[in-house]
Amino acid sequence: RTTSFPTVTTTAVPTNTTIKSNPTSTPTVPRTTTCFGDGCQNTASRCKNGGTWDGLKCQCPNLYYGELCEEVVSSIDIGPPETISAQMELTVTVTSVKFTEELKNHSSQEFQEFKQTFTEQMNIVYSGIPEYVGVNITKLRLGSVVVEHDVLLRTKYTPEYKTVLDNATEVVKEKITKVTTQQIMINDICSDMMCFNTTGTQVQNITVTQYDPEEDCRKMA
């Protein structure tokens, strides 16, 4: 077999950070100050740091608070994302379908029919993987039909998310290798939904969404 799999390189999420974090993202300081009486008009023109007057008070943007938005918050509450995704770029070769120029056109009926059959086949292949979300065909090319596609995986955020996704990607590799080895043409006849070229399976790239709280904090600031 010449199935090729790349090594995945990802940056580990920092396990500790000085940024205050809680899942409900409740502000720790009030961001508005109400004003009553004649002096309010003067206050209106004095809102600082991008604050806007709403008729009663200065509405302060993120990072600022106080009557005139003159105070800077000392901490920002940020929480991790709810889910983390991984995208695997795979290539498989389908031998049970003859390539036509129409398959290059994603709007054509031929492409749509191929996409439906291929998607159904992959949903069966990966059905036992809880993290499996679906497949997205990016390109079809001659050979008979070389299918470049993405397999999307998703897991809830935990400190162990990388291990969960690493395990899921390994199972994807095992399952696609198995099906493309077993479902092959015999005497030019395919007795399965789709048949494959045993040697045409490749994993080009695996991208795992990185969660970096410090980067999130920089963006907010």
Epitope: E82, N123, Y132, V133, K156, Y157, T158
Partner: antibody
Framework: QVQLVQSGAEVKKPGASVKVSCKAS????????IHWVRQAPGQGLEWMGR????????KYGPRFQGRVTITADTSTSTVYMELSSLRSEDTAVYYC??????????????WGQGTLVTVSS | DIVLTQSPASLAVSPGQRATITCRAS??????????MHWYQQKPGQPPKLLIY???SLESGVPARFSGSGSGTDFTLTINPVEADDTANYYC?????????FGQGTKVEIK
Amino acid sequence: QVQLVQSGAEVKKPGASVKVSCKASGFNIKDTYIHWVRQAPGQGLEWMGRIDPANGYTKYGPRFQGRVTITADTSTSTVYMELSSLRSEDTAVYYCARNYGTSYPNAMDYWGQGTLVTVSS
Amino acid sequence: DIVLTQSPASLAVSPGQRATITCRASESVETYGNSFMHWYQQKPGQPPKLLIYRASSLESGVPARFSGSGSGTDFTLTINPVEADDTANYYCQQSNEDPYTFGQGTKVEIK
């Protein structure tokens, strides 16, 4: 083996609150989501919300928003569902259920036995 | 919210025959070609039991008499052949979008 064991039946007066517990065993609740679903007598199933016990994230159905609170105690592998401002139409069997796998969206593969909550004056 | 409409509301089938329940969603429950539609069986006094997940995947331990099909907005649960023990309510459920929603249920009786 995977099990979800819920607290016993409750009878409450209108306006009161009820807190139902769901104790998990056979798996780590931090590794998945726990959902709550209710079923009024003779009626269908209604999703109330879910919690990610690893970080406390919750998502509630719009019909229950503001009245339901789902919490988790990972030290005891127990998830709680509290429903406040009870009315007679809240009389139902309340189920907790485990999400299939670590990702979502997904199905619910294991269910608690159900807790009957009766709201009556 | 995605509304799921099941039909028929009830059906009576003889043992050995085929039972077909359909579930139509008010909008697609598909992500990347994968349909997040699931089927449950519920017998009186019991919690629901997962039969089929993601439209067509058979849950572990569920007899192969049960099968699911469909994509996008139209889904089918088939029991073939039906057995006496299959008397129950059957529900479809989508998890493609919050809030998760269930169909109103289909009551299957064995003649």
